[in-house]
């Protein structure tokens, strides 16, 4: 049964508002998709989560939400929000995961974001942000996650990114962005997924990854990349990376020589013609390897030391004889 | 702990070649840059190239281009700087460093003294 | 080539007196809004030390004495209190575009 606390908790839900205890005799709000065009004023101190999705709102006041001191979750997506003030979640020290996408956005609310040392999670994404300045992340220590995909920047923010030396996983996909500098990601050592697909790269700086030491997962699909990313070679705990729907003519030589962890490569849709003997040596993990229409590929793939393969598709090649090794190399 | 360890002083003679040796230990070696940096006696510090280990990834100081040859080798965890056609300018301790943060040189070898002399 | 150029060549300080040493770039090696300067300690028979990166980030382990300003062409070390083992050379560097390069050193004795 609900205790005597759960009652008081849930006489403090706003009008037409869902409420529900969290099971820590704190209360979880939503008010998501109720036309609402401002914040409900009769919020319970105790609110641990607050979801303002999907409503009408066009502006937050400085202070919007006094008291929310247990204040975890809160979520402004779907909005009409071209603007957030400073002073707009004071006072909200235990924020963990703020959900702003869907807004009008066009820069990231620097201000507003100072001193949020919980945030954990930071949803920007599907907002009109082409510029991120400097400093807007400074204060986000504990930030895990970033989502600032489907915007307008043209360009990384390198200097935003030199704080969040925490982040997990970052998403910059769908904007447009045409190049990346060498040391874009320098102080990223913690991120694991980095999402780039869906811009308008063309090149990489020789160095643009370095620093990524923990990077897992790396998309690059669906670019304008006309050389192979030798860039990818520092990361040395790579295990997925695409780069399909490109412009990419030849793989070279030692193409994967520094991804040994390397378990699916997604690289269909290039104008792949050439692979050099060698670039899929050394492999253990890899499962999954598809050629297709490599014309001037001749001779089989060297895959010594990629012994896990289970599915290898080559055609349109003109390879005319296999070595007598091919039977020992694969499972 | 990490390490950067370079093979003994070498003695040479005007024209000759010298290959220096950097054995790495304490981290993931194809994951950073080795740069090569030498000192004349007295003198500053003179950037000469660096390798990505286990790549074909190079650069070198134009100064240096066609008497430099810098490799690595990944089952000793070794680079190597090779420089021919020795002249008596070349005499100088050769360090090889990590590039770490930014590309700033955070773990540097112990240096290896090269003479070159008649 | 982006020249390197330390000014003074040699600085003569009194104990836990401040010392500063400038460096300046031919050319701006500012990229995306990083500096590509970082500062070394070069004592005698041993290898440099990295102290500073991209301009004024100390490196792990380094005294918090130690700091670093600047951007585009004109940046400074400073030691706010000097101290004994401080006695070194102290070169700047670029890794804007190769080739990088350093500059001629400064030598910190103490008064």
């Known amino acids: 049964g609900s205790s005597p606390r759960s009652g008081v908790l849930l006489r403090g839900c706003p009008t037409h508002c869902h409420c529900e205890p969290d099971g820590r005799m704190l209360l979880r709000v939503d008010c998501s998709d109720l036309g609402l065009s401002e914040l409900p004023s009769n919020l319970s101190v105790f609110t641990s989560y607050l979801d303002l999705s999907m409503n009408n709102i066009s502006q937050l006041l400085p202070n919007p939400l006094p008291s929310l001191r247990f204040l975890e979750e809160l979520r402004l997506a779907g909005n009409a929000l071209t603007y957030i003030p400073k002073g707009a979640f004071t006072g909200l020290y235990s924020l963990k995961v703020l959900m702003l996408q869907n807004n009008q956005l066009r820069h990231v609310p620097t201000e507003a974001l100072q001193n949020l040392r919980s945030l954990q999670s930071l949803r920007l994404d599907a907002n009109h942000i082409s510029y991120v300045p400097p400093s807007c992340f400074s204060g986000l220590h504990s930030l895990r996650h970033l989502w600032l995909d489907d915007n307008a920047l043209t360009e990384i923010p390198v200097q935003a990114f030199r704080s969040l030396s925490a982040l997990q996983a970052m998403t910059l996909a769908l904007n447009k962005i045409h190049h990346i500098p060498d040391y874009a990601f320098g102080n990223l050592s913690s991120l694991v997924v980095l999402h780039l697909h869906n811009n308008r790269i063309h090149s990489l700086g020789k160095k643009c990854f370095d620093g990524l030491h923990s990077l897992e997962t790396l998309d690059l699909n669906y670019n304008n990349l006309d050389e192979f990313p030798t860039a990818i070679r520092t990361l040395s705990n790579l295990k997925e990376l695409g780069f399909h729907s490109n412009n990419i003519r030849s793989i070279p030589e030692k193409a994967f020589v520094g991804n040994p962890s390397l378990i699916t490569i997604h690289f269909y849709d290039n104008p792949i013609q050439f692979v050099g003997r060698s670039a899929f040596q050394h492999l253990p993990e890899l499962r999954t390897l598809t050629l297709n229409g490599a014309s001037q590929i001749t001779e089989f793939p060297d895959l010594t030391g990629t012994a896990n393969l289970e599915s290898l598709t080559l055609t349109g090649a003109q390879i005319s004889s296999l070595p007598q090794t091919v039977c020992n190399q694969l499972p | 702990e990490v390490q950067l360890v370079q093979s003994g002083a070498e003695v040479k003679k005007p024209g000759a070649s010298v290959k220096v040796s950097c054995k790495a230990s304490g981290y993931t070696f194809s994951a950073y840059w080795i740069e090569w940096v030498r000192q004349a006696p007295g003198q500053g510090l003179e950037w000469i190239g660096e390798?990505?280990?286990?790549?074909?990834?190079?650069d070198y100081n134009e100064k240096f281009k066609v008497r430099v040859t810098i490799t690595s080798d990944t089952s000793t965890s070794t680079v190597y700087l090779e420089l021919s056609s020795l002249r008596s300018e070349d005499t100088a301790v050769y360090y090889c460093?990590?590039?770490?943060?930014?590309?700033?040189?955070?773990?540097w070898g112990q240096g290896t003294l090269v003479t070159v002399s008649s | 080539d982006i020249v390197m150029t330390q000014s003074p060549d040699s600085l003569a300080v009194s104990l836990g007196e401040r010392a500063t040493i400038n460096c300046r770039a031919s050319?701006?090696?500012?990229?995306?809004?990083?500096?590509?300067m970082h500062w070394y300690q070069q004592k005698p028979g041993q290898p440099p030390k990295l102290l500073i990166y991209l301009a004024s980030n100390l490196e792990s382990g380094v005294p918090d004495r130690f700091s670093g300003s600047g951007s585009g062409t004109d940046f400074t070390l400073t030691i706010s209190s000097l101290q004994a083992e401080d006695v070194a050379v102290y070169y700047c560097?670029?890794?804007?575009?190769?080739?990088?390069?350093f500059g001629q050193g400064t030598k910190v004795e103490i008064k």
């Open positions: 390798i990505l280990p286990g790549s074909d990834s190079t």
């Open positions: 460093a990590r590039g770490g943060h930014y590309g700033s040189l955070d773990y």
């Open positions: 050319e701006s090696v500012d990229n995306y809004g990083n500096s590509f």
């Open positions: 560097q670029q890794n804007y575009e190769d080739p990088f390069t």
